[in-house]
């Protein structure tokens, strides 16, 4: 049990106040983290509160400003990037968001040696992506879907690709579906470690169907947004990987990297690229039916001037019980011999663990094991491997950082974080300097987040980078809800849940219950992290009990739970929420006439299906930007879990799992349906179809749309959204305003 201290003493009770909705909407109780921008083994950059870019040397203890806020302000810079030779800084301004990761910006190059902006051969605008080479100060950038190279910032650019076309051919940047569902980045180009080569992806979207929606704006006529967006079963992007020698790029030209034969025989995806050395690169490919992944190690043959990907260096990862990997197929972390690597994949017991691959995957040596999961490999040095897992005390929603000594035999394992601030910190991530000389730990909770700097050899804490003192002080007179993380055992399934309880919670009383659900494959909602958010307010001020439940399909508890939903989304996720609600009712403090469920995105889908389950458990519920049919969602995501919507594959379940098919069952619940009209991700089409089905079934419901808003419903829409949902829930629970 994790009880967040409410800091309530009877004598002080009158000075304490509950959270207000305004607190949440204003971000009054938001926290800060500190991630050093490492530039060497012992140095990092950080943007100070007054916007100076400061270089810190851990070993000398010295710091100095490398770029003043005055220079930053002169071009309205919101971001920066130092060249590895420390001669130049790019300054980023005019940020303009596109999709989840992508944005365009204007870039200025500042010469640190003379304190002036580089004039002549200035960069075009707006640029879609820009990055320094890992050594020196070469620049690669993407402009109008084409890639350019500068040997020096003041040089004229060399155009590497010429076929880039809006919504047709993407070079060095992903198209919509690769950005959102495969790469999870705004870029698709990768420098080799010393900057000799530049690898890049080309995505051809020529044959992809286009989603079109209106953007209303302020003009007399709305404009139409067109995005090549492959829905389940549709034509997918065609991807090719090229590598160009950046020293003399005009000579040999871009060289296409061959796709493994077993992958190229049918539709496929490229999933990631990892440089090993300047002459060795590792590419990962995935069949469209995403249960087979191939890792291919390619070598540059100087004598032939070609990239050779021998079959002997192809490593196959296959899942027989679900899809390959977790959410994504894991990426390899290469060891110092530049051929063997560490990788997370399922062991024979169905838990994701670190394996060491020297020759073949069949001969992989398992490095971690147990009924828990290794989650991320942070760094491999010559003698240590740093990773995170949820092993400690068998809480799947925790993250601790471990070090395995790989230099000694047998390897020894040490938990670096488990006992540092045990009550406050149970969910960590880490950021390592070169050669892991130093690292920063960022603790996300369950207490107030704290970021600390550590010695990479001894693990000794050097200093606190950010401890959120202001937040701690601000919370001193706030009645925060209590939180507990526990588990239910039901029919051989473990359902972990987080319950958020009102500050003066009394087990003998009855409380309205709100279920917050996401429930998507490989997600996790029950995490030991700090948050003061909308549900904290609902518990603190409105006296609700809020519960989050991780059911079948969720992550980090083994493949049995994860792959249970394979090819049948919308069944067990819903069942498990319902099962948990029944168990909560049995606990005796839930008013079973006042139970609601809400969710966003995948959670909107699950909440809709739960409301339409016909159980009579839920009085009301909210779906924000829900998926309503898997035929409407992106191919890469949907097919990973559902297969294809074809007769000979899984069309039947595609049809059976829609929200629309259950329209009649909404008759006895209060349903609030919410969606942004400019949602590029889960298209407004989803809610339009739910609404149409409800109208056709003559079922009353409530709805709210947000004009020109995307999947995030940001800005003023956020305030309106949470205010609106609060009114809806209070009305449902008969709580006075």
């Amino acid at each position: 049990i994790v009880l967040r201290p409410s800091r309530v003493h009877n004598s002080e009770e009158n000075t304490m106040r509950a959270l207000t909705l305004k607190d949440i909407l204003n971000g009054t109780f938001s926290y800060k983290t500190f991630f050093p921008n490492w530039i060497s083994g012992q140095e990092y950059l950080h943007q100070s509160a007054d916007n100076n870019i400061v270089l810190y040397n851990i070993e000398t203890g010295q710091s100095y400003t490398i770029l003043s806020n005055r220079t930053m302000k002169s071009v309205n810079a919101s971001n920066y990037g130092l060249s590895p030779d420390r001669q130049f800084v790019y300054l980023e301004s005019d940020y303009s968001k596109l999709w989840r990761y992508s944005y365009t910006a204007t870039y200025y190059i500042y010469d640190l040696s003379n304190g002036e902006f580089v004039r002549g051969n200035e960069l075009p605008r707006p640029i879609q992506y820009l990055c320094w080479s890992p050594v020196g100060s070469k620049l690669a950038y993407v402009y109008q879907n084409n890639i350019y190279l500068k040997q020096r910032p003041g040089d004229p650019p060399f155009q590497i690709t010429f076929n880039g076309r809006e919504n047709k051919i993407f070079n060095g940047i992903p198209d919509w579906v690769y950005e959102e569902e495969m790469l999870a980045t705004k870029y698709a180009l990768w420098w080799s470690p010393n900057g000799k080569f530049l690898a890049y992806a080309e995505f051809n979207d020529t044959d992809i169907p286009v989603i079109a929606y209106s953007y209303y704006g302020d003009e007399q006529y709305p404009r139409t947004i067109n995005i090549p967006y492959p829905k389940a079963g549709a034509k997918n992007p065609v991807v090719r990987i090229f590598i160009i020698d950046t020293t003399y790029p005009a000579y040999v030209g871009p060289q296409e990297v061959p796709v493994p034969a077993m992958i190229a025989s049918s539709d496929y995806y490229f999933s990631w690229l990892t440089w090993v050395t300047d002459e060795r690169v590792c590419l990962q490919w995935l069949k469209r039916v995403q249960n087979v992944s191939v890792l291919s190690i390619c070598d540059f043959r100087e004598d032939w001037q070609t990239w050779d990907c021998p079959k002997t260096q192809e490593h196959i990862e296959e899942s027989r019980t679900g899809w390959a990997g977790g959410f994504f197929v894991s990426t390899p972390v290469f060891s110092y011999d530049a051929i063997s690597y560490y990788k997370i994949f399922s062991d024979k017991d169905g838990y994701k663990h670190i394996h060491y691959i020297k020759d073949t995957v069949e001969n992989a040596i398992q490095i971690t094991s147990g009924k828990w999961e290794a989650i991320n490999i942070f760094r491999v040095t010559q003698d240590s491997l740093f990773y995170s897992s949820n092993e400690f005390e068998e809480y799947p929603g925790r993250r601790n950082i471990y070090r395995i000594s790989i230099g000694s035999y047998p390897p020894s394992k040490k938990c670096v974080t488990c006992h540092l601030r045990k009550e406050r910190c149970q969910y960590y991530t880490a950021s390592f300097s070169d050669y892991a000389k130093y690292y920063a730990l960022v603790c996300y909770g369950p207490g107030i987040p704290i970021s600390t700097l550590h010695d990479g050899r001894t693990d000794q804490e050097i200093k606190i980078l950010e401890e959120n003192k202001e937040l701690e002080n601000a919370l001193k007179n706030i009645q925060l809800p209590k939180e507990e993380i526990k588990k239910l055992e039901v029919d051989e399934i473990t359902l972990w849940y987080k319950m958020i309880l009102p500050p003066q919670f009394d087990r003998s009383k009855k409380y309205p219950l709100l279920i917050q659900v996401y429930g998507g494959p490989c997600s996790q909602s029950v995490r030991s992290v700090f948050a003061v958010n909308w549900i904290s307010y609902l518990a603190s001020k409105e006296g609700m009990v809020i519960a989050l439940v991780d059911g079948r399909g969720t992550a980090f508890q083994g493949d049995k739970l994860l792959y249970a939903v394979y090819r049948k989304l919308g069944v067990y996720e819903v069942e498990d929420q319902i099962t948990a609600v029944r168990k909560f009712i049995e606990m005796g403090f839930i008013d079973e006439k006042r139970i609601a469920i809400w969710g966003w995105s995948y959670g909107g889908y699950v909440s809709s299906l739960a409301l339409a389950s016909g159980t009579g458990l839920f009085k009301c519920g909210i779906a924000v930007a829900p998926v309503s049919s898997w035929e409407y969602y992106a191919s890469v995501y949907t097919e990973r879990f559902m297969g294809l919507p074809t007769k000979d594959d899984n069309l039947e379940h595609y049809k059976n799992s829609t929200v629309m098919a259950r329209a009649e069952y909404f008759r006895n619940v209060d349903y609030l349906l919410i969606h942004g009209t400019a949602d590029d991700n889960v298209h407004f089409q989803n809610s339009a179809q739910i609404a149409k089905a409800l109208v056709n079934a003559q079922v009353d419901f409530q709805a709210m749309w947000y004009s020109d808003q995307n999947h995030g419903l940001s800005g003023l829409s956020t305030n309106h959204l949470y205010t609106h949902m609060t009114h809806f829930l209070k009305q449902c629970f008969s709580l006075s305003d």
Partner: antibody, heavy 117, light 108 residues
Amino acid sequence: EVQLLESGGGLVQPGGSLRLSCAASGFTFSSYAMSWVRQAPGKGLEWVSAIIGSGSITYYADSVKGRFTISRDNSKNTLYLQMNSLRAEDTAVYYCAKGWFGGFNYWGQGTLVTVSS
Amino acid sequence: EIVLTQSPGTLSLSPGERATLSCRASQSVTSSYLAWYQQKPGQAPRLLINVGSRRATGIPDRFSGSGSGTDFTLTISRLEPEDFAVYYCQQGIMLPPTFGQGTKVEIK
């Protein structure tokens, strides 16, 4: 030893077609971008077209775009230039050269294309 | 497109003399993308100076390339009888790749 040998030139009427070939040997043909460069009688050099090693991407000078098609057959170590809608101003010696946009370090001996009625 | 202007059009020199050939670009090119070729009558061009001012394989060290930005020079330190030919500069930084009109080095 690297060798490039062009063939297929000759006399053709305006509006006619011709297909030039360039047989390559002495290097890993499929690894390299290849180009066609031409030289009108008594004039300078003019780049015409290029193709990357895999053959998947091609480039053309504006003067020939839509009329000429560059291609390659890596299994035969051969580069091609299909020339359609030929004009008098296409009259030139056509060279195949090893390289993409520059540093053409090996050239064929050239093949003469004469467009005349 | 980038226009390369070579000067002089013709250079009349005696064997043993130093030849300096100029190539001026209409916009910045940098030496990483500039090459020089030699062509003799009835023969294909031959690469002398590769992109990046590097001498091509088998080219004698009397040939050297220099320059940056828009101004480039090919220098032949001591002319040999076989050096009398037409010389072309070529840029490969921008599509289409372009050649200068050539400088003819003839025997005086």
